[in-house]
């Protein structure tokens, strides 16, 4: 679809192309199983055009369909930790709140490996919040090129 | 500066009981993995325990797992080792180690160490 | 467990003179996760080396590292007096993370 001299004169936002890549902040404390993310230049090459963060988890702004991205490599591993001397590590990433609109949208198992990777389409609407789960013991690396999460706006 | 200051070795029955606490400062505690790292007189590096800035995940070596606990308060920007049924070849120097900001677990800075002895 | 062996046990050199450091892993290492220390009596040892080939910050560009899989090796071009020390290598790609019985390098 051709924009208009008018509409390519607009920012981002104002049409609807929401975006943001995230980096990891920090784990939650005991019994808190959800990844704290940051974004923003000052730390790299990482952003938020549109969504917003509530407390380190991902806020969506604008109602549409979105393609939802992450990658976790964790830092503290082992090839026996993934399957049989620790509870299985599994990463999720749900819409957590409002609780009306609660589900999970990704989920993965580390199984014998050190990193996953996945994506998928979904609609998302404005509230929603974003959260990502690592449950298990491991701990996933702060670096930029093994670990982020992102969302991009696809359409309405 | 970065500093690492251990305290808490001493001697110990077999059975016994210590706990060890590493006092931080120079960074921000609470955004980086800690450990433990421990050397028997004249023998060779052991890990023996690591925990996450935040506290909620931690691991041990399987020599020391059901008797230790590692712990940390980042409101006093401490780490803490506690040693419980503490046995002869856990005589060591004892040394706290901070992770790298990516949390991998190799060791940019170290404490001066403390010594536990156990004997009886 | 990965075991790390290092070799020589001791290590007679020179001061100017370039030393070898060998550390083989019994299977190979994630990544290349592995680290190299240096640690003088008494004291706590020092990070030199991070995976295998980054060197850690101060550090001399007389200290480098390279391998991959299972065969690592720590390379002093010109040894200085303040070199002489035992050398540990440590794997942390995969728990327990496990650390050599170290390489002596003394003065010949």
């Known amino acids: 679809q051709r924009l208009s001299r008018a509409q390519q004169q607009l920012p981002l936002e104002s049409l609807g192309w929401d975006i943001a890549e995230l980096q990891l902040n920090h784990t939650g404390p005991q019994q808190d199983p959800r990844l704290y993310w940051q974004g923003g230049p000052a730390l790299g090459r990482s952003f938020l055009r549109g969504p917003e963060l509530d407390k380190g988890q991902l806020r969506i702004r604008r109602d549409g369909i979105y393609m939802v991205h992450i990658q976790v490599t964790l830092a503290i591993c082992s090839s026996t930790s993934t399957s049989r001397h620790h509870h299985p590590t599994t990463l999720a990433v749900g819409i957590c709140s409002p609780a009306s609109r609660s589900i999970s949208l990704l989920r993965l198992s580390f199984h014998q490996g050190c990193t996953i990777a996945s994506q998928r389409l979904t609609p998302l609407a404005r509230g929603d919040t974003l959260c990502t789960n690592l449950t298990g013991t491991l701990l996933p690396s702060r670096n930029t090129d093994e670990t982020f999460f992102g969302v991009q706006w696809v359409r309405p | 500066e970065v500093q690492l200051l251990e305290s808490g070795g001493g001697l110990a029955q077999p059975g016994g009981s210590l706990r060890l606490s590493c006092a931080a400062s120079?960074?921000?505690?609470?955004?980086?993995?800690m450990s433990w790292v421990r050397q028997a007189p004249g023998k060779c590096l052991e890990w023996v325990s690591a925990i996450s800035g935040s506290g909620g995940s931690t691991f041990y070596a399987e020599s020391v797992k059901g008797r230790f606990t590692i712990s940390r308060d980042n409101s006093k920007n401490t780490l803490y080792l506690q040693m419980n049924s503490l046995r002869a070849e856990d005589t060591a120097v004892y040394f706290c180690a901070k992770h790298d900001y990516s949390n991998y677990p190799y060791f940019d800075y170290w404490g001066q160490g403390t010594l536990v002895t156990v004997s009886s | 467990e990965i075991v790390l062996t290092q070799s020589p046990g001791t290590l007679s050199l020179s001061p100017g003179e370039r030393a070898t450091l060998s550390c083989r892993a019994s299977?190979?290492?994630?990544?290349?996760?592995l680290a190299w220390y240096q640690q003088k009596p008494g004291q706590a040892p020092r990070l030199l080396i991070y995976g295998a080939s980054s060197r850690a910050t101060g550090i001399p560009d007389r200290f480098s590292g390279s391998g991959s899989g299972t065969d690592f090796t720590l390379t002093i071009s010109r040894l200085e007096p303040e070199d002489f020390a035992v050398y540990y290598c440590?794997?942390?790609?995969?728990?327990?993370?496990?650390f050599g019985c170290g390489t002596k390098v003394e003065i010949k």
């Open positions: 120079g960074f921000t505690f609470s955004s980086y993995a």
């Open positions: 299977q190979s290492v994630r990544s290349s996760y």
């Open positions: 440590q794997q942390y790609g995969d728990l327990p993370f496990t």
